[in-house]
């Protein structure tokens, strides 16, 4: 009786269990009673990443510099090209089809995690005792100046956006 199911890495066609093509190769011809499946390697700009019966290989992803992309890992016949973003940019989505500039943390916020090619800047509010007076994609919240260690006193309290202002101690007469 002709098979109704085939082994792993095979497919059923015309009552025959034919071998799938290995990753990096496309199907040219199904097997017959007398011949094996015929497969051909994908060309240099193409890939197939699974055991398959595809008659066309997939095109490697193009990392478009006009969209801020660059090649992180060159594709092979078995893998797609991996794109990442140029310095100062990160992927808009998981598929990384285009890039956007890293977000800056506004005054009162510091950088919790610096952006990468695939993730945006993560900001956090500066807690009591810390401040940020700049809009930056790199600067963390900085601690207020310790007036005491300089033998000075606080003349103006600090905020999340400003440092304390230190001044000389009033001399007791």
């Amino acid at each position: 009786e002709p098979p109704t199911a085939c082994r792993e890495k095979q497919y059923l066609i015309n009552s025959q269990c034919c071998s799938l093509c290995q990753p990096g190769q496309k199907l040219v011809s199904d097997c017959t009673e007398f011949t094996e499946t015929e497969c051909l390697p994908c060309s240099e700009s193409e890939f197939l990443d699974t055991w398959n019966r595809e008659t066309r290989c997939h095109q490697h992803k193009y990392c478009d510099p006009n969209l801020g992309l660059r090649v992180q890992q060159k594709g092979t016949s078995e893998t797609d090209t991996i794109c990442t973003c140029e310095e100062g940019l990160h992927c808009m989505s998981e598929s990384c089809e285009s890039c956007v500039p890293h977000r800056s943390c506004l005054p009162g916020f510091g950088v919790k995690q610096i952006a990468t090619g695939v993730s945006d800047t993560i900001c956090e509010p500066c807690p009591v005792g810390f401040f940020s007076n700049v809009s930056s994609a790199f600067e963390k919240c900085r601690p207020w100046t310790s007036c005491e260690t300089k033998d000075l006193v606080v003349q103006q309290a600090g905020t999340n956006k400003t440092d304390v202002v230190c001044g000389p101690q009033d001399r007791q007469r």
Epitope: D30, C31, T32, E36
Partner: antibody, heavy 112, light 112 residues
Framework: QVQLQESGPGLVKPSDTLSLTCAVS?????????WNWIRQPPGNKLEWMGY???????NYNPSLKNRITISVDTSKNQFSLKLSSVTAVDTAVYYC?????WGQGTLVTVSS | DVVLTQSPLSLPVTLGQPASISCRSS???????????LNWFQQRPGQSPRLLIY???NRFSGVPDRFSGSGSGTDFTLKISRVEAEDVGVYYC?????????FGQGTKLEIK
């Protein structure tokens, strides 16, 4: 239903070229099967001569040296055999076959 | 070339009795994918060969289930469980694992 039909002269003179054609119906010759020529001398065993593939590439029996050519005409869905410099030992029934389906065979006699 | 040796060359059988034909190869017919392209054909008197079994043990469509094939590597067998009058003819094994394809010399089955 796949059908194959051989045609060509039944008598060929020694040293001439034997030419046969196989018309295929019920299946496109450009798909995955190999299209073979097989012969059988009178009262003798079968001998595989060669095949042509769906893509036009072929393989021949080395015993026929450089005498054999198999070609394909996709527009007519047929394939052909040419065997040059024939002698009496080339007298045989010639079959075209996909192996699961065969033509009825044609007797070619080499004689002057 | 791969040599296929069939035995017996002549096989007289009583109607309704079983019959067995052996085909031995000069080298393994299993390819790198684990497939073995050994086929069996029946040629009735005055007719073209007809495919019975492909890839050692697969019965071709329309072939009665009294025909079965078995074997591996270099040793193969065609069995007919109960011979009928219409089974008279010559039986050939054919290997298409290696080029050139080669046939066995044939086994003539006749009724006792």
């Amino acid at each position: 239903q796949v059908q194959l039909q051989e045609s060509g002269p039944g008598l060929v003179k020694p040293s001439d070229t034997l030419s046969l054609t196989c018309a295929v119906s019920g299946y496109s010759i450009t798909t995955n099967y190999y299209w073979n020529w097989i012969r059988q001398p009178p009262g003798n065993k079968l001998e595989w001569m060669g095949y042509i593939k769906y893509d036009g590439s072929n393989n021949y029996n080395p015993s026929l040296k450089n005498r054999i050519t198999i070609s394909v005409d996709t527009s007519k869905n047929q394939f052909s055999l040419k065997l040059s410099s024939v002698t009496a030992v080339d007298t045989a029934v010639y079959y075209c076959a996909r192996l699961d389906y065969w033509g009825q065979g044609t007797l070619v006699t080499v004689s002057s | 070339d791969v040599v296929l040796t069939q035995s017996p060359l002549s096989l007289p059988v009583t109607l309704g009795q079983p019959a067995s034909i052996s085909c031995r190869s000069s080298q393994s017919l299993e390819n790198s994918n684990g497939n073995t392209f050994l086929n069996w054909f029946q040629q009735r008197p005055g007719q073209s060969p007809r495919l019975l079994i492909y890839k050692v043990s697969n019965r071709f469509s329309g072939v009665p289930d009294r025909f079965s094939g078995s074997g591996s590597g270099t040793d193969f067998t065609l069995k007919i469980s109960r011979v009928e009058a219409e089974d008279v003819g010559v039986y050939y094994c054919l290997q298409v694992t290696h080029v050139p394809f080669t046939f066995g010399q044939g086994t003539k089955l006749e009724i006792k």
